[in-house]
């Protein structure tokens, strides 16, 4: 339950907050879960703990893994888990789904796009904003504090927006980028019984033991902005948050995309360090809205190594 997905790019700063909260005066100990090795608090280290925050300055792909934080309140030791994934920088412009933060919707009256996670960093204005990798220019775009305001929003303003800022730590500067999709509300919409595009019903997904696996639940719900539409994953009929396996997490926030004018939602299920017991679980992709609920079931199977028989 007290587990949080965090992700970043190599050579950028990444700061992660312990999912268990406490007063600033409380001691927080951080450990690398796989080895139970304590994370140092000395700032001279590239990866160090600072109270409730775990800082990667800068992050490296090898930092990926599950980190344990223990908040020592006067009464209890509260444990949380930060599931950190550091990705290699993409050479092309496309920002993959797994690097996207939750989608925001805007309309003519309200078109604020907040820069995700920025509150964790020591940054100074102004932010730089990009849309589909192009720097935003023109009087319609205004970078204000930690958000972007777009004047006279049009349908064409939908897309992926990236904020870029500099985190300063003891005089050293580190770059941070974060991307989220922006959709424009369409008043002339309609809603349908959910249609799950992926996975196929009773799909068998091959995975490798010890590797990471991603399952994407993707469904469409109609045209335009949808109310009360959601996609989610269940394990053996239980919500991911209640299942209690920190290695298995849903992507934070749902990515909204418009396919042929349809409003669709994705939810990525990330399984870290696939284990044998994961093959025994039933993975259900659920899509629901006011019309009802549709469920597609997936099971995992072990990917067989390629035979080298003559």
């Amino acid at each position: 339950k007290f587990s949080k997905q965090s992700w970043g790019l190599e050579n950028e700063a990444l700061i992660v907050r312990c999912p268990r909260q406490g007063k600033p005066s409380y001691t927080v100990d951080w450990y690398y879960s796989q080895t139970n090795k304590s994370i140092p608090t000395q700032e001279r280290n590239r990866v160090f703990a600072s109270g409730q925050l775990l800082k990667f300055l800068p992050a490296a792909v090898a930092d990926s893994g599950i980190y344990t934080c223990i908040v020592r309140s006067p009464t209890f030791n509260r444990t949380g888990y930060a599931n950190v994934t550091i990705y290699k920088k993409q050479s092309d412009c496309n920002v993959p789904d797994y690097l996207m933060y939750s989608t925001v919707s805007g309309s003519e009256k309200n078109s604020k796009i907040y820069c995700p996670t920025i509150d964790l960093y020591n940054w100074t204005a102004p932010l730089e904003w990009f849309k589909n990798c192009q720097a935003l220019q023109g009087s319609r775009y205004r970078a204000h504090k930690s958000f972007l305001v777009i004047d006279n929003v049009m349908t064409e303003d939908a897309g992926d927006y990236t904020c870029k800022f500099i985190h300063n730590e003891n005089g050293a500067n580190y770059s941070v980028t974060a991307t989220r999709s922006f959709t424009v509300k369409d008043e002339q919409g309609f809603s349908l019984f959910p249609v799950i595009g992926a996975p196929a019903q009773n799909e068998i997904k091959e995975v490798e033991i010890g590797k990471n696996a991603n399952l994407t639940c993707s469904a469409c719900f109609g045209k335009g902005t949808q109310f009360l539409a959601a996609v989610l994953w269940q394990l053996n009929g239980t919500k991911i948050t209640d299942f209690g396996e920190p290695r298995i997490q849903q992507e934070e926030g749902q990515n909204q995309s418009f396919s042929n004018g349809l409003a669709c939602l994705d939810m990525v299920l990330r399984i870290a360090d696939v284990k044998e017991e994961d093959l025994l679980l039933q993975y259900d992709c659920l899509a629901l809205n006011l019309h009802g609920l549709r469920r597609h079931t997936v099971r995992l199977s072990r990917k067989n190594p390629i035979d080298h028989h003559s």
Partner: antibody
Framework: QVQLVQSGAEVKKPGASVKVSCKAS????????MYWVRQAPGQGLEWMGA????????AFNQKFKGRVTMTADKSTSTAYMELSSLRSEDTAVYYC??????????????WGQGTMVTVSS | DIQMTQSPSSLSASVGDRVTITCSAS?????MHWYQQKPGKAPKRLIY???KLASGVPSRFSGSGSGTDYTFTISSLQPEDAATYYC?????????FGQGTKLEIK
């Protein structure tokens, strides 16, 4: 809104046990620890112990250790405090209070209405 | 255990008066919380983290202090402020309260 509703008044004989319930609503039960405080007639407030409903972990005031049991039922969002080997000095109002201490601190902002326990032969 | 000594144990003041209650801890604490309790009612949190005003509490109530010495103040006493006031520390186990200060209106 956050509400803590406690069970009704109890009259017990010395040596018996009493179990007081505290039903929570208006927030995610497992997100906050539940604390128990008692107040003898005309006296001050005395902390008895606490439970983390998420994990079932408990912490007690040494004074009550061995006599008090705290449990939490996640399915009904209810916390329980059981005090055994009752004596006359356990006559008091027993309160549950929610404790969630973070930057937007609302620890001990919400209290149950209290349960009067009378121990008398 | 950290002992909390509140003073005075009782006091009587007039409407409009400035009232101060002190709480001394037997060893240093990070924060002090203050509660108001009226007969037959559960305690009501007024001040938390030494000086932060709880939601919906009038601004005439305030708190200050650090280390072992803390102060609770009512800047202008109102008739509805007649009650017993408690300080409480939550810096170490067990959580402890002061013995209370009974405030009467003259």
């Amino acid at each position: 809104q956050v509400q803590l509703v406690q069970s009704g008044a109890e009259v017990k004989k010395p040596g018996a046990s009493v179990k007081v319930s505290c039903k929570a609503s208006g927030y995610t039960f497992t997100d906050s620890e539940m604390y128990w405080v008692r107040q003898a007639p005309g006296q001050g407030l005395e902390w008895m112990g606490a439970i983390d409903p998420e994990t079932g972990d408990t912490a007690f005031n040494q004074k009550f250790k061995g006599r008090v049991t705290m449990t939490a039922d996640k399915s009904t969002s209810t916390a329980y405090m059981e005090l055994s080997s009752l004596r006359s000095e356990d006559t008091a109002v027993y309160y549950c209070t929610r404790a969630f201490d973070n930057d937007n601190d609302d620890a001990f902002a919400y209290w149950g209405q209290g349960t009067m326990v009378t121990v008398s032969s | 255990d950290i002992q909390m000594t509140q003073s005075p144990s009782s006091l009587s003041a007039s409407v409009g008066d400035r009232v101060t209650i002190t709480c001394s801890a037997s060893s240093s604490v990070n924060y002090m919380h203050w509660y108001q309790q009226k007969p037959g009612k559960a305690p009501k949190r007024l001040i938390y983290d030494t000086s932060k005003l709880a939601s919906g509490v009038p601004s005439r109530f305030s708190g200050s202090g650090s280390g072992t010495d803390y102060t609770f103040t009512i800047s202008s006493l109102q008739p509805e402020d007649a009650a017993t006031y408690y300080c409480q520390q939550w810096s170490s186990n067990p959580l402890t309260f002061g013995q209370g200060t009974k405030l009467e209106i003259k």
